[in-house]
């Protein structure tokens, strides 16, 4: 098995992800490992010779680049926030900040924007993965009440007026909660839709 | 962990069509963001297309938008590239990729590859 550098008349090598072809000689010469750069080329005599990127630059994969990639923010103006740091042999990872979901992407998010918010009477369906898509409004379950316009207001069980010793004066709706009143005293107009103790 | 399979490699004249799987096993597939790399010989390997774990937020590189289409059914933990137009500069190991967090910035999951030759 040869050991690069060596020679190739196919302009192949046998390793495509971490050799690769130096046509000046005719070679097959090492790439560089994810975290580092060619500081010096290869020849026919002696493989490359790869250094550590510099703070605050990385290279991912195999390579032979000369020079590292600058690591970039996660941009607060485009709504992104750090996951985890830049490090050597990896860029810096972003997502969308709370509240907000991923409205542009790119090969990663590019562009966030604040999640819509839900009318009352429904409730934004959970997802496994917040964050990366809008929300979708689905209407309260039966016996349950929402009554708000908001990205993250979930439905709430209708109040039980037997379980407080009241009982019940007007029924629940997905918009509006069950209105109790003492079992001794009738409803006055005015007060309707209010819990009277 | 996460292993990624890709099949559907080999030669094809140009202007014809391939179809690359991705078939991934071991943890929870359905929230990864998944792509396909590829490398040409004496090229840097390079993003080609990534999808989301619902089917949306694709990405094409320029070179092949209109041409190639990335596509995931969750039931087959599969992921697909379908190649079509091929031309020579298609030429290349291409790699399937899966990160974990889903949101594309670092893909952490990585298939051995498989070769597309496309030549006459």
């Known amino acids: 098995q040869a050991v690069p550098p060596y020679a190739s008349e196919n302009q192949t090598c046998r390793d495509q992800e971490k050799e690769y072809y130096e046509p000046q000689h005719r070679i097959c010469c090492s790439r560089c490992p994810p975290g580092t750069y060619v500081s010096a080329k290869c020849s026919r005599i002696r493989d490359t010779v790869c250094a550590t990127c510099a703070e605050n630059s990385y290279n991912e994969h195999w390579n032979y680049l000369t020079i590292c990639q600058l690591c970039r923010p996660c941009d607060p103006v485009m709504g992104l926030e750090e996951i985890a740091p830049c490090t050597s042999k990896r860029k810096t990872q972003c997502r969308c900040q709370p509240g907000m979901f991923c409205a542009a992407w790119a090969l990663e998010c590019t562009h966030c924007e604040l999640l819509s918010d839900c009318p009352p009477g429904t409730e934004a369906e959970l997802k496994d993965e917040v964050g990366k898509g809008n929300n979708h409004c689905v209407p309260c379950k039966a016996g349950h009440f929402q009554n708000t316009s908001s990205p993250s207001a979930r439905c709430q069980p209708h109040t039980r007026c037997e379980n407080q010793g009241l009982v019940e004066a007007a029924p629940g709706t997905a918009q509006s909660d069950t209105t109790c009143k003492n079992p001794l005293e009738p409803l006055p107009p005015e007060m309707s839709g209010t819990m009277l103790m | 962990e996460v292993q990624l399979v890709e099949s559907g490699g080999g030669l094809v004249q140009p202007g014809g069509s391939l179809r690359l799987s991705c078939a991934a096993s071991g943890r929870t597939f359905t929230n990864y963001r998944m792509a396909w790399f590829r490398q040409a010989p004496g090229k840097e390997r390079e993003a080609v297309a990534a999808?989301?774990?619902?089917?949306?937020?694709?990405y094409y590189a320029d070179s092949v938008k209109g041409r190639f289409t990335i596509s995931r059914d969750n039931a087959k933990n599969t992921v697909y590239l379908q190649m079509n137009s091929l031309r020579p500069e298609d030429t290349a190991v291409y790699y399937c990729?899966?990160?974990?967090?889903?949101?594309?910035?670092?893909?952490?999951?990585w298939g051995q590859g498989t070769l597309v030759t496309v030549s006459s």
């Open positions: 999808i989301n774990w619902n089917g949306g937020g694709t």
């Open positions: 990729a899966a990160d974990s967090t889903g949101w594309g910035s670092y893909f952490d999951y």
